[in-house]
C-alpha cells in the first residue's frame, strides 16, 4: 500500500470520501456530490470538482477576453452534469430548465435556451493562457529559471507533461503560461490542460485541492514567487456561438 492507502485519503483531491472497500480491501475514494470513484494518483476532472464544490460555493472565476473568440465566465458556479468519465456534458441545464452549451472546461459557449437546445459535441478547449501578476521583488526573475521552475511545477504537482506547456512569457511583473493540447495529442494517462489550469488557479488563490500537501510554495532560485492576481483565457477548437457581441 502507499502511504495514502494506509490512512485511506486521496492526495490529489480533498473533496472525496475514502474507505477501504476497493478490490482486495484497497482504499477507494469517491468524489463528493457525484459519488464517482476517482484515481488519486492524478487530478480529478474539473466537472467532478465543481460538482463537489457546490456544497460550499465560493466566488466565481473571472475570465478575460484576449480576442473575439475568448470566453468570459460570467455565469459563476453551477452544479454541472458530468459524463461517466467525469467530463462536462456538452449541454448543461439548471433547475428552471434553462440550458446552454459548454466547452471542455465547463464555460458557457452559446446563448441560453430551453430544453430543446441541442449541443452536438463537447467542444475542446485546446489553448489556455494563464496570466499572472507577481508581487514586487528585489529584481526580475531570470526568464529561463522561471520557465524551468513552472514546467517542473506543472509536471510534479499537476502531472502535466512539459510538452503541453507551450511557452512561458515574462515581462515583470506579468507571467503568462501557455498551455496547448489538441484532442489527438493526448496519450493514455496524460492530464488534461483544463484540469491542470483549474488546480493551479485554486492553488494560487490559496484554495488548494490537494490533501495534506502544503499550499503552493513557488520559488525561483530560492526567491519566493507570490502571485497577486490570476486571469485565465480559454480558447476553443471551434469558436463560440453567441447571437451578439457580449
Amino acid at each position: 500500500h502507499t502511504a495514502a492507502q494506509d490512512n485511506c485519503t486521496c492526495p490529489t483531491n480533498k473533496m472525496t470520501v475514502c474507505s477501504p472497500d476497493g478490490p482486495g480491501g484497497r482504499c477507494q475514494c469517491r468524489a463528493l456530490g457525484s459519488g464517482v470513484a476517482v484515481d488519486c494518483s492524478t487530478l480529478t476532472s474539473e466537472c467532478l470538482l465543481l460538482k463537489a464544490r457546490m456544497s460550499a460555493p465560493k466566488n466565481a472565476r473571472t475570465l478575460v477576453r484576449p480576442n473575439e473568440h475568448a470566453l468570459v465566465d460570467n455565469d459563476g458556479l453551477y452544479d454541472p452534469d458530468c459524463d461517466p468519465e467525469g467530463r462536462f456534458k456538452a449541454r448543461q441545464c439548471n433547475q428552471t430548465s434553462v440550458c446552454w452549451c459548454v466547452n471542455s472546461v465547463g464555460v458557457r459557449r452559446t446563448d441560453k435556451g430551453d430544453l430543446s437546445l441541442r449541443c452536438d459535441e463537447l467542444v475542446r478547449t485546446h489553448h489556455i493562457l494563464i496570466d499572472l501578476r507577481h508581487r514586487p521583488t528585489a529584481g526580475a526573475f531570470n526568464h529561463s529559471d522561471l520557465d524551468a521552475e513552472l514546467r517542473r511545477l506543472f509536471r510534479e504537482r499537476y502531472r502535466l507533461h512539459p510538452k503541453f506547456v507551450a511557452a512561458v512569457h515574462y515581462e515583470q511583473p506579468t507571467i503568462q503560461i501557455e498551455l496547448r493540447q489538441n484532442t489527438s495529442q493526448k496519450a493514455a494517462g496524460d492530464v488534461d490542460i483544463g484540469d491542470a489550469a483549474y488546480y493551479f488557479e485554486r492553488d494560487v488563490k490559496g484554495e488548494s485541492l490537494f490533501q495534506g500537501r502544503g499550499g503552493l510554495d513557488l520559488r525561483v532560485r530560492g526567491e519566493p514567487l507570490q502571485v497577486e492576481r490570476t486571469l485565465i483565457y480559454y480558447l476553443d477548437e471551434i469558436p463560440p456561438k453567441f447571437s451578439m457581441k457580449r
Partner: antibody, heavy 119, light 108 residues
Framework: QVQLQQPGAELVKPGASVKLSCKAD????????MHWVKQRPGQGLEWIGE????????SYNQKFKGKATLTVDKSSSTAYMQLSSLTSEDSAVYYC????????????WGQGTTLTVSS | DIQMTQITSSLSASLGDRVTITCRAS??????LNWYQQKPDGTVKLLIY???RLHSGVPSRFSGSGSGTDYSLTISNLEQEDIATYFC??????????FGGGTKLEIK
C-alpha cells in the same frame, strides 16, 4: 494482446549509423507514449527518450541528444530510433517500451535489439 | 536528475521465502515509483506501478509499498520463476526518468 516486435540483433561498423525498429501491435499506436531504453552488458537500464506518435513530439535524456533520433511511422505502427556516429560504447541492448503519461510506467516491452558495434 | 539507489545488488533466498527488495530516491517522488522484472533471457515486465498497484497478469505474491524517498518490492512466497533482476524506476519529475541499478535475485 499488446506486442512490441524488435529485430534480435544488428551488427554495424564504428562511425556508421543504424536505425532500430519497433513494430507495435494490439493497441492504438497513437494513444500511448513510446520510450527507448538502453542496457549495456551486465549493467542497469538507462532511459534514452520518448515520442508521442500522434504528433511526433520527442524529448531526450541530455546524455543521448545528438546520438539518438526518435521517429514513428503511423501507417505501419512502427517506432524507430536512429543512432549515429557509433562507437563501442553504443554496443548494448536497446528496448522500446510503451509508456503511461501519468505514472510514467513502461507497461509493455519489446524483446530488445542487441546492437554490436565492431569493425 | 533524481538518483535511484538499490543498495543490495544481489540477494540469495530459498524457494517459499518472503523476499523484500528496497529502493531509495534522492528526493521525494510522491509514490511515482514502478518496479520491473528482467529475466535472464532479457525479457522485461512491469510488475508494480505507482508504488503498490499490481500490473495486469502479475501474480498477487508481488506487492509494493513505500512513500517519500523509500520504497520496497515484496515477493511473499518465492517461486523458481521469480529468479530475475528487479529494477525500480521513478516517473515523478521532468525527464530523464531514472532506474535503480537493479537487484539480482538468486536461489540459495
Amino acid at each position: 494482446q499488446v506486442q512490441l516486435q524488435q529485430p534480435g540483433a544488428e551488427l554495424v561498423k564504428p562511425g556508421a549509423s543504424v536505425k532500430l525498429s519497433c513494430k507495435a501491435d494490439g493497441y492504438i499506436f497513437t494513444s500511448y507514449w513510446m520510450h527507448w531504453v538502453k542496457q549495456r552488458p551486465g549493467q542497469g537500464l538507462e532511459w534514452i527518450g520518448e515520442i508521442t506518435p500522434s504528433d511526433n513530439y520527442t524529448s531526450y535524456n541530455q546524455k543521448f541528444k545528438g546520438k539518438a533520433t526518435l521517429t514513428v511511422d503511423k501507417s505501419s505502427s512502427t517506432a524507430y530510433m536512429q543512432l549515429s556516429s557509433l562507437t563501442s560504447e553504443d554496443s548494448a541492448v536497446y528496448y522500446c517500451t510503451r509508456g503511461h503519461g501519468n505514472y510514467v510506467s513502461f507497461d509493455y516491452w519489446g524483446q530488445g535489439t542487441t546492437l554490436t558495434v565492431s569493425s | 536528475d533524481i538518483q535511484m539507489t538499490q543498495i543490495t545488488s544481489s540477494l540469495s533466498a530459498s524457494l517459499g521465502d518472503r523476499v523484500t527488495i528496497t529502493c531509495r530516491a534522492s528526493q521525494d517522488i510522491s509514490n511515482y515509483l514502478n518496479w520491473y522484472q528482467q529475466k535472464p533471457d532479457g525479457t522485461v515486465k512491469l510488475l508494480i506501478y505507482y508504488t503498490s498497484r499490481l500490473h495486469s497478469g502479475v501474480p498477487s505474491r508481488f506487492s509494493g509499498s513505500g512513500s517519500g524517498t523509500d520504497y520496497s518490492l515484496t515477493i511473499s512466497n518465492l517461486e523458481q520463476e521469480d529468479i530475475a533482476t528487479y529494477f525500480c524506476q521513478q516517473g515523478y519529475t521532468l525527464p530523464p526518468y531514472t532506474f535503480g541499478g537493479g537487484t539480482k535475485l538468486e536461489i540459495k
